[in-house]
Interface confidence: low
């Protein structure tokens, strides 16, 4: 059975040309975190794995960099980075959870962060 | 389907090195993480360093940074494991794996293994 949560930075905003932090946090299991990916809708920017640690997908290696933690920082972002960014935890036993990010690259100045909020 | 093929190991005495190689077949190496890992006896399989397809991002397990690198040579599908400055507590054996990118299970394709031996 399923008992864990993800919290995520939930829906953010930013500057384009700035930097983001993705942070998503697994909480309510003891379920043992084999790897984390991190995907763009269809691409998978990075995985965090357990045994072989950090790789980032080589299409991104430039804009993106590991940590902190288990979150992901997305660099030099243009218009074109805005959408929808997903954690998966994979883990044993439970399974898979995946917790959802909404990231919206500004023009102006008026990048200010969303709350955060619990993905069941 | 990867089949793994390990080779370099041997006795050496502490101080030494040696230069492990792992030839793969059957799939090119630019969708995987390329990975060494080591057992030595009444111990767990633990990682020591892994490369991604590309060869831009490496990872190494504390006990080694300085004195190991990993390295990939794409057009002989080949990935390398340069050991320098060996250590007695080096002594076990090493295996080479190839993890595809989208990697969701605990391991994949394994390589037979290779012994290394450091003598004090």
């Known amino acids: 059975m399923m008992t864990g949560t993800i919290e995520t930075t939930g829906n953010i905003s930013a500057e384009k040309g700035g930097s983001i932090i993705l942070q998503c946090h697994l909480s309510s299991t003891t379920a043992q975190v084999t790897q984390v990916n991190w995907e763009q809708q269809d691409q998978l920017l990075a995985i965090c794995n357990a045994d072989l640690g950090w790789h980032i997908s080589p299409s991104f290696k430039d804009r993106v960099a590991p940590g902190p933690g288990l979150g992901l920082t997305l660099q030099s972002l243009t218009v074109n980075d805005t959408g929808e960014y997903f954690c998966i935890y994979h883990t044993y036993p439970d399974g898979t959870y995946t917790g959802r990010i909404f990231l919206e690259v500004l023009e102006s100045s008026v990048a200010e962060h969303g709350a955060r909020f619990q993905i069941p | 389907e990867v089949q793994l093929v390990e080779s370099g190991g041997g006795l050496v005495q502490a101080g030494g090195s040696l230069r492990l190689s792992c030839a793969a077949s059957?799939?090119?190496?630019?969708?995987?993480?390329m990975g060494w890992f080591r057992q030595a006896p009444g111990k767990e399989r633990e990682g020591v360093a892994t490369?991604?397809?590309?060869?831009?991002?490496?990872y190494y397990a504390d006990s080694v940074k300085g004195r190991f690198t990993i390295s990939a040579d794409n057009a002989k599908n080949t990935v390398y494991l340069q050991m320098n400055s060996l250590k007695p507590e080096d002594t076990a054996v090493y295996y080479c794996?190839?993890?595809?990118?989208?990697?969701?299970?605990?391991?994949?394709?394994w390589g037979q293994g290779t012994q290394v031996t450091v003598s004090s």
């Open positions: 490369i991604s397809g590309g060869g831009d991002t490496t």
């Open positions: 059957g799939r090119t190496l630019d969708d995987y993480v």
């Open positions: 794996a190839a993890v595809p990118w989208r990697w969701t299970t605990r391991r994949d394709y």
